[in-house]
């Protein structure tokens, strides 16, 4: 069970801590485009020339809201857009083109790394300053999706990162005999 999502004032959802969202629709023309954020794209399926492939990272800036509060400053979020395919075949609004073989695997540009950012909130009525940490996408990568797999079973074709799925971080058990190992009942 992860942290709840953090809504911005455009009614879109910024993920809370522990949440890893699906990429949003690919046709948002209000976003400021930046492909790969200056990084070379990951190698999808049988690539001859790395520069032929494109994984788009879109940046946009929003004020975030939490209850009646609003972030003191806007937050810039990165969104991973569309499929990974040869750059020459990808129009500005990325189309779902089967570019290698009809029954071959599908590649998608999805979040790779995340970062948590502390956001100062401005709230009505209360004198106390309040803050929230929001989890934002830090980079994108290409992952393979075959038609036999659910979208949650994406295959990683970039260098493996240690970030576990859904914010779960494998850890050694608590240290020492004093630690109570009983699992918490924090979820309904």
């Amino acid at each position: 069970q992860g942290w709840q999502a953090f809504r911005n004032d455009a009614t879109e959802v910024i993920p809370g801590l522990g949440e890893y969202p699906e990429p949003p629709p690919e046709n948002n023309q209000t976003m400021n485009r930046a492909e790969n954020g200056g990084r070379p794209p990951h190698h999808p399926y049988d690539a001859k020339d790395v520069s032929e492939y494109s994984c788009r990272e879109l940046h946009y800036t929003r004020f975030l809201t939490d209850g009646p509060c609003r972030s003191a400053k806007p937050v810039t979020e990165l969104v991973c857009s569309g499929q990974c395919g040869p750059a020459r075949l990808l129009p500005n609004a990325i189309g779902r083109v089967k570019w290698w073989r009809p029954n071959g695997p599908d590649f998608r540009c999805i979040p790779d790394r995340y970062r948590a950012q502390r956001v100062q909130l401005l709230c009505p009525g209360g004198a106390a300053p309040r803050s929230r940490k929001v989890r934002l996408v830090a980079s994108c990568k290409c992952k393979r999706l075959t038609r036999f797999h659910n979208q949650s079973e994406l295959k990683d074709f970039g260098p493996e990162t240690a970030r576990p799925q859904k914010g779960r971080k494998p850890r050694p058990g608590a240290r020492g005999a004093k630690a109570n190992q009983a699992e918490l009942e924090n979820a309904y």
Partner: antibody, heavy 118, light 107 residues
Framework: QVQLVQSGAEVKKPGASVKVSCKVS????????QHWVRQAPGKGLEWMGW????????EYASKFQGRVTMTEDTSTDTAYMELSSLRSEDTAVYYC???????????WGQGTTVTVSS | DIQMTQSPSSLSASVGDRVTITCKAS??????VAWYQQKPGKAPKLLIY???TRWTGVPSRFSGSGSGTDFTLTISSLQPEDFATYYC?????????FGGGTKVEIK
């Protein structure tokens, strides 16, 4: 799943200090705020303070100011709460809690009983 | 400090009953109120925050309302697992403070 596992029960003499640990798993501690709340036997909940493990920022309830210190070891994802100059009225169950805000307590540890007795 | 006064301090109810718990703040706290459930020997669990927003996984029978100084937690149809003590908490001004609790017992 986010889990918080606290250290075991402590018995202390008046005037001594106690340091309670809270091991966080399921998420990097630096991406959260850590809170401490206590509950005296048969009584209600009392907020002690919060800390931001990433930058070491803290906010303590004025009642505990000067007696409480909240720290974290981000390499082990463990939070610590040290309370000094203990008196009998500090006898309570001490809970660590974590969350993405400075104001609500999303996930809780199982509690650590601290008994102050001469 | 802002005082949070809960009432009643305890109540007896039956499974299926509609239960209402109130919390009164000593000064205006806008909607900066959370509700927690605690069972004997266990840690509290977050139910509601911002007066009316349900936390992840909390059943829809739990609802919160109110603003300013008067707040309400309602359990629309009490279930066996709902017998517990409920606390309100304000986070409008430091120090964050809790109400004294309302114990919901089986009639």
């Amino acid at each position: 799943q986010v889990q918080l596992v606290q250290s075991g029960a402590e018995v202390k003499k008046p005037g001594a200090s106690v340091k309670v640990s809270c091991k966080v798993s399921g998420f990097p501690i630096k991406d959260t705020f850590q809170h401490w709340v206590r509950q005296a036997p048969g009584k209600g909940l009392e907020w002690m303070g919060w800390s931001d493990p990433e930058i070491g920022d803290t906010e303590y309830a004025s009642k505990f100011q000067g007696r409480v210190t909240m720290t974290e070891d981000t390499s082990t994802d463990t939070a610590y709460m040290e309370l000094s100059s203990l008196r009998s009225e500090d006898t309570a169950v001490y809970y660590c809690a974590t969350g993405d805000t400075t104001y609500k307590f999303d996930f809780w540890g199982q509690g650590t009983t601290v008994t102050v007795s001469s | 400090d802002i005082q949070m006064t809960q009432s009643p301090s305890s109540l007896s109810a039956s499974v299926g009953d509609r239960v209402t718990i109130t919390c009164k703040a000593s000064q205006d706290v806008h909607t900066a109120v959370a509700w927690y459930q605690q069972k004997p020997g266990k840690a509290p669990k977050l139910l509601i925050y911002w007066a009316s927003t349900r936390w992840t996984g909390v059943p829809s029978r739990f609802s919160g309302s109110g603003s300013g100084t008067d707040f309400t937690l309602t359990i629309s149809s009490l279930q066996p697992e709902d017998f517990a003590t409920y606390y309100c908490q304000q986070y409008s001004d430091y120090p964050w403070t809790f109400g004294g609790g309302t114990k919901v017992e089986i009639k």
